[in-house]
Amino acid sequence: LKGQEFAPSHQQVYAPLRADGDKPRAHLTVVRQTPTQHFKNQFPALHWEHELGLAFTKNRMNYTNKFLLIPESGDYFIYSQVTFRGMTSECSEIRQAGRPNKPDSITVVITKVTDSYPEPTQLLMGTKSVCEVGSNWFQPIYLGAMFSLQEGDKLMVNVSDISLVDYTKEDKTFFGAFLL
Amino acid sequence: LKGQEFAPSHQQVYAPLRADGDKPRAHLTVVRQTPTQHFKNQFPALHWEHELGLAFTKNRMNYTNKFLLIPESGDYFIYSQVTFRGMTSECSEIRQAGRPNKPDSITVVITKVTDSYPEPTQLLMGTKSVCEVGSNWFQPIYLGAMFSLQEGDKLMVNVSDISLVDYTKEDKTFFGAFLL
Amino acid sequence: LKGQEFAPSHQQVYAPLRADGDKPRAHLTVVRQTPTQHFKNQFPALHWEHELGLAFTKNRMNYTNKFLLIPESGDYFIYSQVTFRGMTSECSEIRQAGRPNKPDSITVVITKVTDSYPEPTQLLMGTKSVCEVGSNWFQPIYLGAMFSLQEGDKLMVNVSDISLVDYTKEDKTFFGAFLL
């Protein structure tokens, strides 16, 4: 219907228009994680606040057990920021002495799980080497892009090291999606 | 009206559909900041270009006095990038000698002000420790997410150190919002 | 038609509403780059996957020869992430000795080309000094914002050093746009 006025009423076939306010949307915010059992060789998934403060889910977009459930097929914009913070000594010393007391990298992955498909699909990855000179370091990784999703798909955010996630403030670490 | 064709004309009740081109939208770009009085314990707010070059406001989204004014309630995608740049010597030397010639961190906050609410709400924060080895450093912080806003809400971008903001190019530092 | 019910059928003037699923959209993913001739003083453009894996173009948004072609005028959200990775020795040594074996910075630019306009327009730039202490480094630069584009405009992603782009995974380096 690009640029075209609606036809008069005797024409009964219409495109499936819908109110924007009716579209599935969610913005989830960080909460303190509880230590859990991780699957081998898989980054742990974060769990989220879905109704308090800035967080919400609406129009059949539901959050359950670390997953956002996609209620209808379509193109979604998906985004997340994870702020990491850690402690470290001089990086080159760590490398030289082979002391492994800090991660070489921090990574965020937004993952899609489709029940009919055996393997999860990595939609977005932000990965950064961490080699900070100072004793305290902190930094965010932001991701966002558009994907075609199917009804029943599930989205989660995985991180390389859950113990480095800054869970103190809802504006620092978050996860969202909305139907375009 | 999800996935449903419009009913024939004798049915007079319709969802509040609206033309997408009619939605409030703004993309603001950086300008050189003028020194101002900052409130104690509050990061200073940036002011912006709203009509020249790539910048625009449309459909009743107005910019005034460092604020974007939200003209209608709904879910908005809000984003900003601030590019910081500075000069520093070896970070660990600064720490040891306690020399304050560089920030320990750079921070961007997108803040919502609601007149009926006494405290501003921090919607998004990007914060990063800065401990650069080289003498010149520069880096962006990007933020973006969806929030439910009310008519009359005001949005601003605050930064930890206004003197480190790169105001030289409109594509490096910017702020925008649009109704979904 | 903001907030207004549709008028009964005898009123023949309508706003140009359109189905959301009909809007031009693209998400492109990284592929291994082939060495090409670069224009002097211009960052090289990346080329992209447009139909395999997570990549797609739809509703007349076409990809050709490193460019996304804008098929209709309107406001678009445009985004890209480029993950860079490199090898380096101690940064201060490089500076002191003036050895050029690593970039001083990594930069991503999303550029608009309009045939009727002689110069490309830089819409978005993410630029970061790179002065890593460790021997291996990697990091993403993410960009995203809204722009008013005209039918026939072309979009591309330019980078400061094509040899440092991580082309190994489609979730690490990508480029997309969608009509709002």
Epitope: R32, Q33, T34, P35, T36, Q37, H38, P44, G86, M87, R99, P100, N101, K102, S135, N136, D161, I162, S163, L164, V165, Y167, T168, K169 | - | -
Partner: antibody, heavy 118, light 107 residues
């Protein structure tokens, strides 16, 4: 659910060493930092340091540097804290604790009383 | 090291009272402050993180506020089970440090 079970009480002479163990269950042991904290009788809490079970990396409070050693055995999900050259003011309840971040203590062991007396 | 100073060291209150405990850091710790409750003969219990965020399962009568150097723990209406010792802990940097504790006893 998460559980941390510590070894039993110890009585040691000044100058000796003590090793306290902490067996973890109910979560991925290698995924979270393990801390050691002590509390002298009638006193407050004092942090000794941490171990990252995945890598064995440690971070000790300066006060205990050179006297404390933290180790782990990932095959049995157990962390160990050894304190050497004991003095009478090392008499305390020693706790292991873990949490979802490197700096918070969501879960605590039951505590191990170490008494240093000649 | 960052010093944490709590006040008061002890206080007496009655069931139903509103009680406030303060904690001051020797330098700014942003919002990186945790609160714990400890009863005699048991390990401490985690109450509040990030200065103001309630740990899962903690009753809503507990609240925290503050940022930078000055923080407070408030119990809006004391219950019998709340009589205990409370500790603040900075989680900004190592070494991790605790306040000396505030003993809350029945009046």
């Amino acid at each position: 659910q998460v559980q941390l079970v510590q070894s039993g009480a110890e009585v040691k002479k000044p100058g000796a060493s003590v090793q306290v163990s902490c067996k973890a269950s109910g979560y991925t042991f290698t995924g979270y930092y393990m801390h050691w904290i002590r509390q002298a009788p009638g006193q407050g809490l004092e942090w000794l340091g941490w171990i990252i079970p995945n890598s064995g990396g440690t971070n000790y409070a300066q006060k205990f540097q050179g006297r404390v050693t933290m180790t782990r055995d990932t095959s049995i999900s157990t962390a160990y804290m050894e304190l050497s050259r004991l003095r009478s003011d090392d008499t305390a309840v020693y706790y292991c604790a873990t949490g979802s971040s490197w700096e918070g203590f969501d879960y605590w062991g039951q505590g191990t009383l170490v008494t240093v007396s000649s | 090291d960052i010093q944490m100073t709590q006040s008061p060291s002890s206080l007496s209150a009655s069931v139903g009272d509103r009680v406030t405990i303060t904690c001051r850091a020797s330098q700014s710790i942003s919002s990186y402050l945790n609160w714990y409750q400890q009863k005699p003969g048991t390990a401490p219990k985690f109450l509040i993180y990030g200065a103001s965020r309630l740990q899962s399962g903690v009753p809503s009568r507990f609240s925290g506020s503050g940022s930078g150097t000055d923080f407070t723990l408030t119990i809006s209406s004391l219950q019998p089970e709340d009589f205990a010792t409370y500790y603040c802990q900075q989680s900004d940097t190592t070494p991790i440090t605790f306040g000396q504790g505030t003993r809350l006893e029945i009046k």
